[in-house]
Interface confidence: low
């Protein structure tokens, strides 16, 4: 009966050797793709000279296979009922799912030039930086290949800096051969309602990026949730990509390959300003760019990126305030294409399908001492790229799932 099913589910979702959950958890059976769209700047000279609106044209998708590597350093701690691990990073280019090659070129913001005056605000230092920017023939914008932009290139300006700093720049550099973690998550053995919930990340229960409760590591990593998910539940999860915990709410019921799933979506409220959603007050960490915390739809993750002026948003500034998108032309936000969702099978709590969408932006501000930026009359949050990371349970796995889980319940 129902009790037996519940007992079986509770046993099989525990993260320990021999369970269904553990096998899929160690190495996901789902093929995960990460598609990139790059924002190619159409009027770089006009922007640098006249502080015009930035005209962008998205180009993509350029698709990589990701999350194909098994978790490593898996260590069970029977005392506190946790399991720790690291998630190795890797990306393999998929030419057949892409509009071009990794050698395709794009005109994008010069990441080092934009970041330098933000990191080094002292006027004297900026004079020195300016001479190095000029000497290296760098400017506000640059042309880079997809491979360089994503995974790293040796920056000519930074290479001239006369003291030891990293001279390699890339939106995701370093990525291949790195790991995310250490994650320590509850294995659910003593309390199934905590299964997969993150106990600590990199040895800490908080991030040290945000003030107050915004700094908490809440929920799971979104690959699964504690079982018996109800529509009224808010699903909380931590995303290292955006350096924060976030949440999803029930949106609709979906049939996924014959399996009834709940589609949970990230609500606009999660990206709201503190005026609209007071809970977000501690995600507003600076007053100028945020117009005294009234702007919304962008998240300053600079503290998590060694002080670099990195801002995360939804693609095309979906759910962002007009002041954020106004200086950029060529954006067309669309709820269906640009929102993030998780399709969760409610009995097991497994995420059987998902689409994680986010946009990486860099803040560039006027800098009087740096010629490449001195003509700017306003700050811009410049879109660099947006990504769509998706995974769907395979047909074979779906059949197996129906037989073992949903079929038995019917």
């Amino acid at each position: 009966g129902d009790m037996l099913i519940e007992k079986t589910i509770k046993r099989e979702v525990v993260l320990e050797e021999g369970t269904t959950a553990f096998k899929n958890w160690v190495k996901t059976g789902t093929t995960v793709y990460r598609q990139f769209w790059i924002f190619d700047v159409q009027n770089p000279d006009d922007v640098a000279k006249n502080s015009s609106k930035i005209k962008v044209k998205q180009r993509g998708p350029y698709t990589y296979r990701v999350r194909y590597l098994a978790k490593e350093n898996i260590t069970q701690d029977p005392e506190d009922h946790t399991v720790s691990f690291v998630q190795p990073n890797g990306a393999i280019f998929e030419p057949s799912l892409s509009v071009g090659t990794e050698d395709d070129n794009f005109t994008v913001l010069n990441l080092a030039v934009a970041a330098a005056p933000h990191i080094y605000q002292n006027s004297f230092v900026q004079v020195v930086l300016n001479s190095l920017i000029k000497k290296s023939k760098s400017s506000m914008f640059q042309t880079r290949s997809l491979k360089e932009l994503l995974w790293g290139y040796k920056d000519p300006f930074l290479s001239l800096v006369p003291y030891p700093i990293s001279t390699t720049v890339g939106v995701f550099y370093p990525y291949n051969d790195t790991v995310d973690g250490v994650y320590k998550v509850f294995n659910g053995k003593d309390n199934i309602s905590k299964v997969a919930i993150i106990e600590s990340y990199k040895g800490k229960r908080n991030l040290s990026y945000w003030p107050s409760y915004c700094d908490m590591i809440n929920g799971t990593d979104a690959a699964s949730f504690p079982p018996f998910v109800e529509k009224s539940r808010t699903l909380r999860f931590f995303s290292s990509d955006i350096c924060r915990s976030i949440y999803a709410v029930f949106g609709s019921e979906i049939d996924l390959k014959g399996i009834p799933v709940y589609r949970f979506v990230l609500p606009a409220n999660a990206f709201a300003s503190p005026l609209q959603n007071p809970d977000n007050h501690c995600f507003c960490t600076e007053k100028v760019i945020s117009n005294n915390c009234t702007s919304y739809g962008v998240l300053d993750i600079g503290k998590c990126k060694e002080g670099k002026p990195v801002y995360i948003s939804l693609p095309h500034f979906l759910h962002a305030s007009p002041d954020v998108s106004e200086p950029i032309e060529g954006l067309h936000p669309n709820e269906d294409e640009h929102r993030t969702y998780l399709d969760v099978e409610p009995i097991t709590g497994f995420t059987l399908q998902f689409a994680k969408r986010l946009q990486v932006n860099i803040l560039v501000k006027p800098a009087r001492k740096i010629e490449a930026l001195k003509n700017l009359k306003r700050p811009y949050i410049v879109p660099i790229l947006w990504l769509n990371e998706t995974g769907t349970i395979g047909d074979e796995k779906a059949e197996m799932f129906k037989t073992q889980v949903t079929g038995k319940i019917k």
Partner: antibody, heavy 129, light 105 residues
């Protein structure tokens, strides 16, 4: 079994300073965050101070901020609370508290008081002239 | 602040629920004190975790911003003041409830 023994309480004079020590045993002291919580006579509990396992993260309650210093010695399995410029309202029982984790949840004013899994018996402090 | 009822009472064998309301979704700890100034005992931490020395009749749960301590089959020696502890996002500080006195009739 986990044991937390506080010492250093007693009669103190206003404006003076006190030093409380908590000696821990029965667990790997260097793996857990430790803290102090106090209770004024006939009142509820109040967070005083906390320190992460490695001595890195520190959090003080608003009533003692600027007057309190928490330190720990992992070799000796002790955690010390020093409180200066004592006031009458510092009177109460001071409890040593162990977190179930290596760190407290930090807010800008203090940690979450949800993960205390063991307490000392308390040491009484009376601030009076 | 965290809000708790000042007192609850029950007869032996009954189930008692003590609630604690915070200002946002949170985790809760529950701490037992048999007399003022005496030792504190953790009966629940992290909303649902029970220390190994605590009998299974003590359990904890959370729903939204409210934490609940449930004592199933209450006994005379459960008579005590129960404090909840968490974080109060409205004041941005660590918080304890004022305590709930459990009387076993």
């Amino acid at each position: 079994a986990v044991t937390l023994d506080e010492s250093g309480g007693g009669l103190q004079t206003p404006g003076g300073a006190l030093s409380l020590v908590c000696k821990a045993s029965g667990f790997d002291f260097s793996s857990y965050a430790m803290g102090w919580v106090r209770q004024a006579p006939g009142k509820g509990l109040e967070w005083v101070a906390g320190k992460a396992k490695d001595g890195g993260g520190t959090a003080y309650g608003s009533a003692v901020k600027g007057r309190a210093t928490i330190s720990r010695d992992n070799g000796q399995s002790t955690v010390r609370l020093q409180l200066s410029n004592l006031r009458a309202e510092d009177t109460g029982v001071y409890y040593c508290a162990k977190s179930a984790y290596g760190d407290w949840f930090y807010g800008s004013s203090g940690p979450y008081a949800d993960s205390i899994d063991a307490w000392g018996h308390g040491t009484e402090v009376i601030v009076s002239s | 602040a965290l809000t708790q009822p000042s007192s609850v009472s029950a007869s032996p064998g009954e189930t008692v629920k003590i609630t604690c309301s915070g200002s946002s979704d949170s985790w809760y700890g529950w701490y037992q004190q048999k007399s003022p100034g005496s030792a504190l005992v953790t009966v629940i931490y992290d909303s649902t975790n029970r220390p190994s020395s605590i009998p299974s009749r003590f359990s904890g749960s959370t729903s939204g911003s409210t934490g609940t301590l449930t004592i199933t089959g209450v006994r005379a020696d459960d008579e005590a003041v129960y404090f909840c502890g968490s974080f109060d996002s409205s004041t941005d500080s660590t918080a304890f409830g004022a305590g709930t006195t459990l009387t076993v009739l």
